[in-house]
């Protein structure tokens, strides 16, 4: 299953970044696991997870990390409190869990570049 | 508002053939699996099978395989269900269901009498 | 295929009392993804079935919190805290998670 992430994203000098992920349709998939991977090297590690269902047609990532929203076959991601040592490519992998058959797809990853923003200088 | 019409039920003789119909309005219709599930007189609700509205591929329950064909037309957002070489035992109200994780949307009801 | 066991046939509830009715899988209906596609629906006569539970415990939107169910792997149960008259029909347990997906045979629940 093809799976399609923008390839650079710049993350906000609040240190969030967004964007979507999005999968071939659907079909009938009435339940999809959407992960965000962080990959550094040959490690991946999981950044956040979410299951929505498309009777709610709104994911809500039950995660300190992510917050998102889905509509039919895009999800909107949004990653909170990066720091400059987040910077690095991170990959959506969806998963069509129900009902069967079981499919799996993995973006190629987006690029996130995390700026820390400069202190203020004192005020006299 | 979401619907599932049912029609096409009739008194039919054995070894004759029916198709009953199901349409869907208020809804991507490709977007649900479609579901055939079976009420004999008294009796309790057996699952026929499904058919995936966006790839057309229908799965039947072993008892369903061979005389009953699922199929779609997705220009008029309906749902067939096709019975050949009919039986007595097949006298029963068919019911169709949309399916997500569960069965919120079902048709009415259209009855098969199968009788000489 | 899993068989799906209810039991009682049925049941005969005076208004107000509580009542129970259980759903028995012969293998464990947890899906590979871990999840428990069990399904409670009421049907009443001339009437299609209605949703009142899915995924074992959640109950469908506009299902009074009378109605909740329970259980794991194989045994399942749907509670009727307070039983009222419109709560009459038959009940069935449903299994989504392997193909054949089945209901049970059904619970007769008729009111004093």
């Known amino acids: 299953m093809h799976v399609a992430q923008p390839a650079v994203v710049l993350a906000s000098s609040r240190g969030v970044a967004s964007f979507v992920c999005e999968y071939g349709s659907s079909g009938n998939a009435a339940e999809v696991r959407v992960t965000v991977l962080r990959q550094a090297g040959s490690q991946m590690t999981e950044v956040c997870a979410a299951t929505y269902t498309v009777e709610d047609e709104l994911a809500f990532l039950d995660d300190s990390t992510c917050t998102g929203t889905s509509s039919g076959n895009k999800v909107n991601l949004t990653i909170q409190g990066l720091r400059a040592m987040d910077t690095g490519l991170y990959i959506c992998k969806v998963e069509l869990m129900y009902p069967p058959p079981y499919y799996v797809g993995m973006g190629n990853g987006t690029q996130i570049y995390v700026i820390d923003p400069e202190p203020c200088p004192d005020s006299d | 508002e979401i619907q599932l019409v049912q029609s096409g039920g009739d008194l039919v003789k054995p070894g004759g053939s029916l198709r009953l119909s199901c349409k869907a309005s208020g809804y991507t219709f490709t977007n649900y699996g479609m579901n055939w599930v079976r009420q004999a007189p008294g009796k309790g609700l057996q699952w026929m099978g499904w058919?995936?509205?966006?790839?057309?591929?229908?799965t039947y329950a072993d008892d369903f395989k061979g005389r009953f064909t699922f199929s779609l037309d997705n220009a008029k957002n309906t749902l067939y269900l096709q019975m050949n070489s009919l039986r007595a035992e097949d006298t029963a109200v068919y019911f169709c269901a949309r399916r997500s994780i569960y069965y919120p949307y079902w048709g009415q009801g259209t009855t098969l009498t199968v009788s000489s | 295929d899993v068989l799906m066991t209810q039991t009682p046939l049925s049941l005969s509830v005076s208004p107000g009392e509580p009542a129970s009715i259980s759903c028995r899988s012969s293998q464990s209906i947890v899906y590979s993804n871990g999840n428990t596609y069990l399904e409670w629906y009421l049907q009443k006569p001339g009437q299609s079935p209605k949703l009142l539970i899915y995924?074992?415990?959640n109950r469908f939107s506009g299902v009074p919190d009378r109605f909740s169910g329970s259980g794991s792997g194989t045994d399942f149960t749907l509670r009727i805290s307070r039983v009222e008259a419109d709560d009459a029909g038959v009940y069935y347990c449903f299994q989504g998670s392997h193909v054949p997906w089945t209901f049970g045979g059904g619970t007769k629940l008729e009111l004093k």
């Open positions: 995924k074992v415990s």
């Open positions: 058919i995936n509205t966006y790839t057309g591929e229908p």
